[in-house]
Interface confidence: low
């Protein structure tokens, strides 16, 4: 249980105040984290509060400014990147967001040796992606969907690809669906470790159906946004991987990497690329029916100047109970022998664990085991493997960092973080310098976040990088809600929940309950993290109890729970929220006439289905940007969990699991439906169809659209959204304004 002290003793009661909605919208209680920008084993860069770029040397304790705020300001730079040879810095300005990860920007190159911007052969604008080589100061960049290479920043560019075309052919950058659902990056090019080769993906979207929506702007006529967007069952992008020798790029040109035969026999995806050495690369492929993944290790053949991927170096990962991997198929972390690797996948008991693969997956040596899951491998050195898991104290919503000594036999395991600040910190991530000489730990809670620097050999804390003192002081006179994380055992299913309770919570009283739900496959809402957000305000000021429940389909508790929703989205996720609500009512402090549910995106889908479940449990609810039918959502995501919307596959459940099919059931609840009209991800179409079905069923409901807003509803729309939802809930719960 995490009880946030509300510090309400009689003597202090007068000076304490509840959170306000304004606090939340202004970000008054936001926290800072510190991730060093590592540039060597013992050095990192950091942008100071006054915008100087400062280099820190941990071992000498010295720091100096490598780039002044004056230089940054001269081009209005918002980001920077130091070349590995430390001779140049790129400065990024005119940031223009595209999708979740992608953006375009203008780039200037600053020469640190003479203190001037590089003139001549300047970069074109706007650039879609730019990066330094891992060694020296070569530049690769993507402009108008084509890839260019510069040997030095002042040199003329060498054009690598020529077929790039807007919305048709993408080189070195992903198309919409690969960016959002497969790579989760803005780039699709990868330098080899010493910068000899550059690998890149080409995505051909020529045959993909296009989603078109209006962008209203300020003009007389709205613009139409067109995005090649494959919905479930539609034609997918065609992907090819090429590698070019950057030392002699014109010599043989880009060489295509062959696709494994068992993958190429039907529709497939490329899922990731990992360089092992300058002349060995590892590619991961996935069948369109995403239960078979192939990891292929390819070697450069000097004599033929080609890449060879022998069948003996193909490793197959297959799931018989669900899809391959968790949210994504995990990526390998290679060991120093440059052929064996560590990888997270399900063990025989159905828990995701680290395995060591030396020759075949069948002969994999299991490194971690237990009824918990390894979540991320951070770093493998010659004697240690650092990873995160939720093993400690058996709370799935925690993250601790562990070190396994792989240099000794049998390997010994130690938890690096479990005892550092055990009340304050139970959810960590880490960032390692070269060779794991040093690392930063970033603790996200449940207490106020703190970032610390550690010695990679002894794990000793060297210094605090950021402890959020100002936030701590600001919260001293705030009545924060109490939070507890517990579990319900129901029909052999463990439902973990987080309950956020009003500061003066009294078990003998009755409180309105708001369920906040996401519930998407491989997600996790019940986490031991710090947050002062909208629901904190609802508990602190408005006296609501808020609960988050991780039901079937959620992550890090084993495959039985995760894969329970396979091919059946919209069933068990909803059932488990309802089950939890019934259990909360049994606890005796919930006013069963005042229960609401809300969610965003997948959570909007679940909240809509819960409201339309016909249980009579919910008085009202809100769906923000919900999916309403899986036929409307992206192929890569949807088919992973649902299969194809075809008669001989899973069309029946696609049809049965829509929100529209349950329109009649909304008659006895108050429903608020919200969506942005320029949502590139969950298209406005989803809410338009819900609204149409409700109108056709003559069911009253409330709705709000946000013009020209995407899936995030950012900026002023955020303030409007939360104010609007607050009014709706207060009205539903009969709370005075």
């Amino acid at each position: 249980i995490v009880l946030r002290p509300s510090r309400v003793h009689n003597s202090e009661e007068n000076t304490m105040r509840a959170l306000t909605l304004k606090d939340i919208l202004n970000g008054t209680f936001s926290y800072k984290t510190f991730f060093p920008n590592w540039i060597s084993g013992q050095e990192y860069l950091h942008q100071s509060a006054d915008n100087n770029i400062v280099l820190y040397n941990i071992e000498t304790g010295q720091s100096y400014t490598i780039l002044s705020n004056r230089t940054m300001k001269s081009v209005n730079a918002s980001n920077y990147g130091l070349s590995p040879d430390r001779q140049f810095v790129y400065l990024e300005s005119d940031y223009s967001k595209l999708w979740r990860y992608s953006y375009t920007a203008t780039y200037y190159i600053y020469d640190l040796s003479n203190g001037e911007f590089v003139r001549g052969n300047e970069l074109p604008r706007p650039i879609q992606y730019l990066c330094w080589s891992p060694v020296g100061s070569k530049l690769a960049y993507v402009y108008q969907n084509n890839i260019y290479l510069k040997q030095r920043p002042g040199d003329p560019p060498f054009q690598i690809t020529f077929n790039g075309r807007e919305n048709k052919i993408f080189n070195g950058i992903p198309d919409w669906v690969y960016e959002e659902e497969m790579l989760a990056t803005k780039y699709a090019l990868w330098w080899s470790p010493n910068g000899k080769f550059l690998a890149y993906a080409e995505f051909n979207d020529t045959d993909i159906p296009v989603i078109a929506y209006s962008y209203y702007g300020d003009e007389q006529y709205p613009r139409t946004i067109n995005i090649p967007y494959p919905k479930a069952g539609a034609k997918n992008p065609v992907v090819r991987i090429f590698i070019i020798d950057t030392t002699y790029p014109a010599y043989v040109g880009p060489q295509e990497v062959p696709v494994p035969a068992m993958i190429a026999s039907s529709d497939y995806y490329f899922s990731w690329l990992t360089w092992v050495t300058d002349e060995r690369v590892c590619l991961q492929w996935l069948k369109r029916v995403q239960n078979v993944s192939v990891l292929s290790i390819c070697d450069f053949r000097e004599d033929w100047q080609t890449w060879d991927c022998p069948k003996t170096q193909e490793h197959i990962e297959e799931s018989r109970t669900g899809w391959a991997g968790g949210f994504f198929v995990s990526t390998p972390v290679f060991s120093y022998d440059a052929i064996s690797y560590y990888k997270i996948f399900s063990d025989k008991d159905g828990y995701k664990h680290i395995h060591y693969i030396k020759d075949t997956v069948e002969n994999a040596i299991q490194i971690t085991s237990g009824k918990w899951e390894a979540i991320n491998i951070f770093r493998v050195t010659q004697d240690s493997l650092f990873y995160s898991s939720n093993e400690f104290e058996e709370y799935p919503g925690r993250r601790n960092i562990y070190r396994i000594s792989i240099g000794s036999y049998p390997p010994s395991k130690k938890c690096v973080t479990c005892h550092l600040r055990k009340e304050r910190c139970q959810y960590y991530t880490a960032s390692f310098s070269d060779y794991a000489k040093y690392y930063a730990l970033v603790c996200y809670g449940p207490g106020i976040p703190i970032s610390t620097l550690h010695d990679g050999r002894t794990d000793q804390e060297i210094k605090i990088l950021e402890e959020n003192k100002e936030l701590e002081n600001a919260l001293k006179n705030i009545q924060l809600p109490k939070e507890e994380i517990k579990k319900l055992e129901v029909d052999e299913i463990t439902l973990w929940y987080k309950m956020i309770l009003p500061p003066q919570f009294d078990r003998s009283k009755k409180y309105p309950l708001l369920i906040q739900v996401y519930g998407g496959p491989c997600s996790q809402s019940v986490r031991s993290v710090f947050a002062v957000n909208w629901i904190s305000y609802l508990a602190s000021k408005e006296g609501m109890v808020i609960a988050l429940v991780d039901g079937r389909g959620t992550a890090f508790q084993g495959d039985k729970l995760l894969y329970a929703v396979y091919r059946k989205l919209g069933v068990y996720e909803v059932e488990d929220q309802i089950t939890a609500v019934r259990k909360f009512i049994e606890m005796g402090f919930i006013d069963e006439k005042r229960i609401a549910i809300w969610g965003w995106s997948y959570g909007g889908y679940v909240s809509s289905l819960a409201l339309a479940s016909g249980t009579g449990l919910f008085k009202c609810g809100i769906a923000v940007a919900p999916v309403s039918s899986w036929e409307y959502y992206a192929s890569v995501y949807t088919e992973r969990f649902m299969g194809l919307p075809t008669k001989d596959d899973n069309l029946e459940h696609y049809k049965n699991s829509t929100v529209m099919a349950r329109a009649e059931y909304f008659r006895n609840v108050d429903y608020l439906l919200i969506h942005g009209t320029a949502d590139d991800n969950v298209h406005f179409q989803n809410s338009a169809q819900i609204a149409k079905a409700l109108v056709n069923a003559q069911v009253d409901f409330q709705a709000m659209w946000y013009s020209d807003q995407n899936h995030g509803l950012s900026g002023l729309s955020t303030n409007h959204l939360y104010t609007h939802m607050t009014h709706f809930l207060k009205q539903c719960f009969s709370l005075s304004d």
């Epitope: 237990g370 104290e393 130690k414 938890c415 479990c418 794990d459």
Partner: antibody, heavy 117, light 108 residues
């Protein structure tokens, strides 16, 4: 307040059996690893056995195959079933709450087991 | 298994004096070490975990240091209630958890 109270100790003949209990209050035992540690008269501390939150059990080589650790979550009680007892098992047996799987943050007062003919 | 060696076996000091207790591990254990205090007829009590972190309610005259194989427990100024036996325990490599043989701090 966390409290641990051991019981079940006493005099037993070599080869005999005893069952020790450790009743916990102030926390839910099911969420934590628990440990048995013993201390022979005038000697130091020796780890005997442990049980994880998940139910996984561990034993010192000296007691493996003779001792069994278990718990009843509904009673919030930890047990140590000791069979084939030997004179060298004579000790005060402490039950301790384990932080994670690491050190022992709360201890009971102990119960004395004497193995003698 | 990892062997912990504590020294000295007995430390005779007067109230107000500084006590320095040593614990040596047979192989490196990073900072995975705890210290306990045990008074006659009582159960052990956790003092220090992770080599240098004081447990809840432990006065700040107790401090721990060290990492790898050499560890020290320091009591900056002995109070009458500090005369007891002190044990170190490793949790780097387990099972088994191992304890040191103990150091008795007695009144001179």
């Amino acid at each position: 307040d966390v409290q641990l109270v051991e019981s079940g100790g006493g005099l037993v003949q070599p080869g005999g059996s005893l069952r020790l209990s450790c009743a916990a209050s102030g926390f839910s035992m099911s969420n934590f690893a628990m440990t048995w540690v013993r201390q022979a008269p005038g000697e130091g501390l020796e780890w005997v056995s442990g049980i994880r939150g998940s139910g996984t059990t561990y034993y010192a080589e000296s007691v493996k195959g003779r001792f069994t650790v278990s718990r009843d979550n509904s009673k919030n009680t930890l047990y140590l079933q000791m069979n084939s007892l030997r004179a060298e098992d004579t000790a005060i047996y402490y039950c301790a709450k384990t932080w994670g799987t690491e050190y022992f943050d709360y201890w009971g007062l102990g119960t004395l087991v004497t193995v003698s003919s | 298994e990892i062997v912990l060696t504590q020294s000295p076996g007995t430390l005779s000091l007067s109230p107000g004096e500084r006590a320095t207790l040593s614990c040596r591990a047979s192989q490196p254990i990073s900072s995975y070490l705890a210290w306990y205090q045990q008074k006659p007829g009582q159960a052990p009590r956790l003092l220090i975990f992770s080599a240098s972190n004081r447990a809840t309610g432990i006065p700040d005259r107790f401090s721990g240091s060290g990492s790898g194989t050499e560890f020290t427990l320091t009591i900056s100024s002995l109070e009458p209630e500090d005369f007891a036996v002190y044990y170190c325990q490793q949790y780097y490599d387990w099972p088994p958890y191992t304890f040191g043989g103990g150091t008795k701090v007695e009144i001179k």
